[in-house]
Interface confidence: low
């Protein structure tokens, strides 16, 4: 057993440009508080998965009112540590979520309003009993500085708080089979205190409160001999006396689930089904009630008036999870049509539509040419959310308002001279060339030289020249 301790040092604007606006104002004073959630292991768990190692809320910080015109400073913090007690071994590796919450203190209908300012998360390795580790995490434009440590509660010691120590009875040495408890050399390792009633002959424990059975024994206190029918059990080593398989200690032997939880084996370990009002890996965390304010993001807490009855959080739109702690990524459903950009504003979804589309979900295809006139006889062509004018000869530009010089591109080949004409352009070809653009040489016999046929076609076969 032990305690995880978190010390928040500062919460304020991070370095660099784009300093955040102060979360409080003269009109709307507020104060901060923090929530920490701990989970064992280094797995990337979903935000709404239970805080199996425990969770804690800080006290509320001092009321803060922004000074007009002043940049957002480091905000005043609650006093004291956030402490998360753990009953079992410290896992050594853990994941954390630290949330910074704002409590608005203006004239709110129905009491103060809470909103999540920032959430940081990480995965760390940490030995119990070690020094304070320090960390800096950034969430958007905010920066959170904090330190943390895990410490064992006496008589537990060690990097996992699984060894027990007690004062030495003699100054020179510990009892038989017991080592000194480094670094507390004046203390000795204490024998593990197994679950009350655990058979001293047939049971043992690796953690306080456990009762694991030796081969051939079962039951919560290892007092029940395994019947011969268990020879059919696939688990455990072969027994020399009976010649059949005897179950070895299983993960549910001795029922590791506290507070009346029921244990079921899983392929790798065990799983506790906890009674109402308890949660945690071994149902070790006592019940949370609505009085503890477990529902975040404006969730409504129902039930849970006493620790024995569970609470339910009814989440506002955009949030989910047992504590409304997870923001729903509603944009992942791609609600915006026709390539619109989805914006989840928390209280609502917004679609930013591409040109030519409109509507809450960009579902309306606008008539691109509606109200758009193409000048000088040009015709409007719709396409891709933008209008385009196909201009009459002699005109150009987006709306065909510019008079085009058809000869500007020097369209007449082989030295031909270009003349602008009301219907377009005319090429006066140099001697020896012919065609609308003077592109074909004239043979001495008077026949024009057509381009050579592509491979596989005979001259004279019908073909198009582009």
């Amino acid at each position: 057993a032990g305690v995880f301790e978190l010390q928040i040092h500062s919460f304020g604007p991070g370095p660099g440009p784009g300093a955040p606006r102060s979360p409080c104002s003269a009109r709307l004073p507020c104060r901060l508080f923090f929530r920490v959630c701990l989970k064992p292991g280094l797995s990337e768990e979903a935000a709404e998965s239970p805080c199996a190692l425990g969770a804690a809320l800080s006290a509320r910080g001092p009321v803060y009112t922004e000074q007009p015109g002043a940049p957002a400073p480091d905000l005043p913090l609650p006093d004291g540590l956030l402490q998360v007690p753990f009953r079992d071994a410290w896992p050594g590796t853990f994941s954390f979520i630290i949330e910074t919450w704002r409590e608005e203190l203006g004239d709110q209908i129905g009491g103060p309003a809470w909103s999540l300012l920032a959430r940081v998360a990480g995965r760390r390795r940490l030995a119990a009993g070690g020094p304070w580790a320090r960390d800096i995490q950034r969430a958007g434009a905010w920066e959170l500085r904090f330190s943390y440590r895990a410490r064992c509660e006496p008589p537990a010691v060690g990097t996992a708080c699984t060894r027990l120590c007690r004062p030495r009875s003699a100054p020179s040495r510990c009892g038989p089979g017991l080592r000194p408890c480094a670094p507390l050399e004046d203390e000795c390792e204490a024998p593990l205190v197994c679950r009350a009633g655990c058979s001293p002959e047939h049971g043992f424990c690796e953690q306080p409160g456990e009762c694991r059975c030796l081969e051939g024994w079962t039951g919560p206190l290892c007092t029940v001999p395994v019947s011969t029918s268990s020879c059919l059990s696939p688990r455990g080593p072969s027994s020399a006396t009976t010649g059949c398989l005897v179950p070895g200690p299983g993960p549910c032997d001795g029922n590791p689930c506290a507070n009346g939880g029921s244990c079921s084996e899983t392929p790798r370990s065990f799983e506790c089904t906890c009674p109402r009002g308890f949660y945690g890996l071994r149902c070790e965390v006592s019940g949370v009630t609505c009085a503890d304010g477990p529902c975040f993001n404006g969730g409504l807490c129902v039930g849970g008036a006493d620790p024995d009855s569970a609470y339910i959080c009814h989440c506002p739109p955009g949030f989910q999870g047992s504590n409304c702690e997870k923001r729903v990524d509603r944009c992942s459903l791609q609600p915006c049509r026709n390539g619109g950009l989805c914006l989840d504003l928390g209280h609502a979804l917004r679609c930013r539509c591409r040109a030519g589309f409109a509507g809450p979900r960009c579902e309306h295809d606008l008539d691109d040419c509606a109200g758009r006139a193409c000048a000088n006889g040009g015709t409007c062509v719709e396409g891709g959310g933008a209008h385009r004018c196909s201009c009459a000869l002699g005109f150009g530009g987006r709306d065909c308002r510019e008079r085009a010089d058809p000869c500007a591109a020097r369209p007449c080949a082989h030295g031909g001279r270009c003349y602008a004409h009301f219907s377009g352009l005319v090429c006066a070809c140099a001697p020896g060339y012919m065609g609308a653009r003077c592109e074909f040489p004239v043979h001495p016999d008077g026949a024009s030289a057509l381009p050579a046929a592509p491979p596989g076609l005979r001259p004279g076969d019908p073909q198009r020249y582009l």
Epitope: Q7, H9, L81, W132, R134, D135
Partner: antibody, heavy 122, light 107 residues
Framework: QVQLVQSGAEVKKPGASVKVSCKAS????????ITWVRQAPGQGLEWMGD?????????NYNEKFKSRVTMTRDTSTSTVYMELSSLRSEDTAVYYC??????????????WGQGTLVTVSS | EIVLTQSPATLSLSPGERATLSCRAS??????LHWYQQKPGQAPRLLIY???QSISGIPARFSGSGSGTDFTLTISSLEPEDFAVYYC?????????FGGGTKLEIK
């Protein structure tokens, strides 16, 4: 500019205690760790521990000194204190306070006090 | 605890020469190593942090390298004011420890 100004030299008898002060200025006092390092005459540097002034309870001590050293702070005067008890002659040294840089989360010490000579002699 | 061994204990060189100071850790300290300079009667001064990261105000002739257990501080061309004692420090694990120092003296 950042400055760490330490208290003056002390002469103590074995078994007594000494309390060295380190007054910080030129930066936000509560946002930087202060560490204590000592240097015996003609010897190298030895880390004693550190304290986060934003929270007086947040300290790390070298196990070698853990039973004898206490680090505290007074935010009203931006001062950190290091008290060493049960003094012995081998505690004669110059005691430095230093500010730990926050660059990259390093524990490196970027600003140092001028040092306080503590002499333990009977 | 992690022991840092600096070598040589004393290095005699002339101004303009290149100085190479070594620091070896008893076990891997990743890149958690810093270098300090100390002159007689003065407090140490941070030169390099995290093996090779330079500190503003420190001349560019000071550079650091290495990883794991072997680290080097190099002074490319010695100036008269560079003659001092140099310490390495590890911040990989507790307690934080310093090397015994290398005294750089004028030849």
């Amino acid at each position: 500019q950042v400055q760490l100004v330490q208290s003056g030299a002390e002469v103590k008898k074995p078994g007594a205690s000494v309390k060295v002060s380190c007054k910080a200025s030129g930066y936000t006092f509560i946002s930087y760790w202060i560490t204590w390092v000592r240097q015996a005459p003609g010897q190298g540097l030895e880390w004693m521990g550190d304290i986060y002034p934003g929270s007086g309870s947040t300290t790390n001590y070298n196990e070698k000194f853990k039973s004898r050293v206490t680090m505290t702070r007074d935010t009203s005067t931006s001062t950190v204190y290091m008290e060493l008890s049960s003094l012995r002659s081998e505690d004669t040294a110059v005691y430095y306070c230093a500010r730990e840089t926050t660059v990259g989360g390093a524990y490196a010490m970027d600003y140092w006090g001028q040092g306080t000579l503590v002499t333990v002699s009977s | 605890e992690i022991v840092l061994t600096q070598s040589p204990a004393t290095l005699s060189l002339s101004p303009g020469e290149r100085a190479t100071l070594s620091c070896r850790a008893s076990q891997s300290i990743n890149n958690n190593l810093h270098w300090y300079q100390q002159k007689p009667g003065q407090a140490p001064r941070l030169l390099i942090y995290y093996v090779s990261q330079s500190i503003s105000g420190i001349p560019a002739r000071f550079s650091g390298s290495g990883s794991g257990t072997d680290f080097t501080l190099t002074i490319s061309s010695l100036e008269p004011e560079d003659f001092a004692v140099y310490y390495c420090q590890q911040t990989n694990s507790w307690p934080l420890t310093f090397g015994g120092g290398t005294k750089l003296e004028i030849k």
